[in-house]
């Protein structure tokens, strides 16, 4: 039997044991989060699979993910949403300590897909473990990119109160319009629900005492937010290590001085 011809994409293929990983993560999440115990993980996997299996992987739409989004509906309490851009690890370390704040990856759908890659093939029920479309080299409407765009939009739309965002002060563009935060989340915050956006600019160098809140890209962010009648605040986090330490131990005497 001749092997079937398979489309070659520029990106890495589906993460090995993808179905098992998603299912296992779902079971683990629903066990740890009582408010999600009602979720049927087999239905979640079926909805996830249905979004990309048998579909041309450069023609995926947000509509494809709606059944999955519906099953994974979750609300974050007001003032507890943490967005991030180009500084995922620190954001996740923070919410692991500050358990009442949530990034997208602390929610069911984000948790399921974090760090995974997946895609299918047109007209077959197979998962492509060899290659998947690369956002730049192949197409932007691929299963992974569309998934994150869909769930990021929803996450931003449902945020309320004061929303926080962690930004990487070591990058040339601290606020980058091409990031998920810059292209999706910032435009989907709802002014009737969100009073303010507070940016935490995380410094990289120990000796870096500049006020990165005065960076032109941060002023750009304020300009975008201001037109939507959402207040904007910005804080420099000069010492991220100390910042995390002080979240863990706020009573520590060294935490009374600036971080």
């Amino acid at each position: 039997v001749l092997p079937r011809w398979r489309q070659q994409w520029s990106g890495s293929g589906t993460t090995s044991r993808f179905p098992e990983t998603v299912l296992a993560r779902c079971v683990k999440y629903t066990e740890v989060h009582p408010e999600m115990r009602h979720v049927d993980c087999q239905s979640v996997w079926d909805a996830f699979k249905g979004a990309f299996i048998s579909k041309y992987p450069c023609n995926i739409t947000e509509e494809d993910y709606q059944p999955l989004v519906k099953l994974g509906t979750q609300t974050v309490p007001c003032n507890k949403t943490l967005l991030w851009s180009r500084i995922k690890d620190l954001a996740h370390q923070f919410t692991q300590v500050q358990r009442d704040m949530f990034t997208l990856e602390d929610m069911l759908l984000g948790y399921l897909a974090d760090d995974l890659t997946w895609c299918g093939e047109f007209n077959t029920f197979e998962i492509n473990y060899q290659s998947c479309p690369d956002w730049r080299k192949d197409c932007s409407n691929n299963p992974v990119s569309v998934f994150w765009k869909t769930v990021s939009r929803r996450f931003a739309e449902t945020a309320c109160g004061v929303v926080h965002v962690m930004l990487n002060g070591s990058r040339s563009k601290i606020f980058d319009k091409n990031s998920t935060f810059g292209s999706v989340e910032v435009h989907n915050l709802q002014p009737e629900k969100v009073q303010a956006l507070e940016a935490w600019v995380i410094h990289g160098g120990r000796e870096d005492s500049r006020d990165l809140c005065q960076d032109p890209t941060i002023k750009e962010l304020e300009s975008i937010i201001s037109k939507r009648n959402i207040r904007f605040f910005c804080k420099n986090i000069y010492r991220p290590d100390k910042f995390l330490q002080c979240v863990k131990n706020p009573e520590d005497s060294s935490c009374l001085s600036g971080i």
Epitope: K177, H187, T217, K219, E220, S223, I224, S226
Partner: antibody, heavy 118, light 109 residues
Framework: EVQLLESGGGLVQPGGSLRLSCAAS????????MNWVRQAPGKGLEWVSA????????YYADSVKGRFTISRDNSENTLYLQMNNLRAEDTAVYYC???????????WGRGTTVTVSS | QSVLTQPPSASGTPGQRVTISCSGS????????VNWYQQLPGTAPKLLIY??QRPSGVPDRFSGSKSGTSASLAISGLQSEDEADYYC???????????FGGGTKLTVL
């Protein structure tokens, strides 16, 4: 004194091009989003285009998309509007205006007149 | 056809109070920044109201209000120098654009 001064207007034939400039003084130009707004003879104000502080974001009215290009030179404190494939309906006074966060278009120039006619 | 709707004209006698309305939608007036501009004959527009606030230098006879998808400009103690065109404007989040009303010509009788 805070000031915006437009230049570059004039008479041009349909299909022709013009480049408008707006020189800023008296404020930190690189701290402000900038806009072009036009007003056809005897008509109301129509927003044309905007550019963000660093120039990485640009916005256009549907009526000029694909024909006009907004740009800025923060080192020269100057805003530009490159207008190509001009039409009779582009005839107007073109104003540049800064955008002050939470306020609006705070400072306006006096305008430069563009006439598109054969 | 303007995205924001204003009455084309309004009038009043000196000392009177006049209100100019501006109607929009959820994607502009309801959720986003609203401005009012005054354009005296032969001059460039001037920022008069942002949301419901007055920039410094604008007399307190001018006031702005907003309710749902509509905004209003009120001028009390009308004076002859208030004769001008008044425009409302708002950022429209769906269009990613500033939108203006068609303008209201205020005549002081």
């Amino acid at each position: 004194e805070v000031q915006l001064l437009e230049s570059g207007g004039g008479l041009v034939q349909p299909g022709g091009s013009l480049r408008l400039s707006c020189a800023a003084s008296g404020f930190t130009f690189s701290d402000y989003e900038m806009n072009w707004v036009r007003q056809a003879p005897g008509k109301g104000l129509e927003w044309v285009s905007a550019i963000s502080i660093t120039g990485s974001w640009t916005y256009y009215a549907d009526s000029v998309k694909g024909r006009f290009t907004i740009s800025r030179d923060n080192s020269e404190n100057t805003l530009y509007l490159q207008m190509n494939n001009l039409r009779a309906e582009d005839t107007a006074v073109y104003y540049c205006a800064n955008y002050k966060s939470y306020y609006g278009m705070d400072v306006w120039g006096r305008g430069t007149t563009v006439t598109v006619s054969s | 056809q303007s995205v924001l709707t204003q009455p084309p004209s309004a009038s009043g006698t000196p000392g009177q109070r006049v209100t100019i309305s501006c109607s929009g939608s959820r994607s502009n007036i309801r959720n986003n920044l609203v401005n009012w501009y005054q354009q005296l004959p032969g001059t460039a527009p001037k920022l008069l109201i942002y949301n419901t606030q007055r920039p410094s230098g604008v007399p307190d006879r001018f006031s702005g209000s907003k309710s749902g998808t509509s905004a209003s400009l009120a001028i009390s103690g009308l004076q002859s120098e208030d004769e001008a065109d008044y425009y409302c404007a708002s950022w429209d989040a769906s269009l990613n654009a500033w939108v203006f009303g068609g303008g209201t010509k205020l005549t002081v009788l």
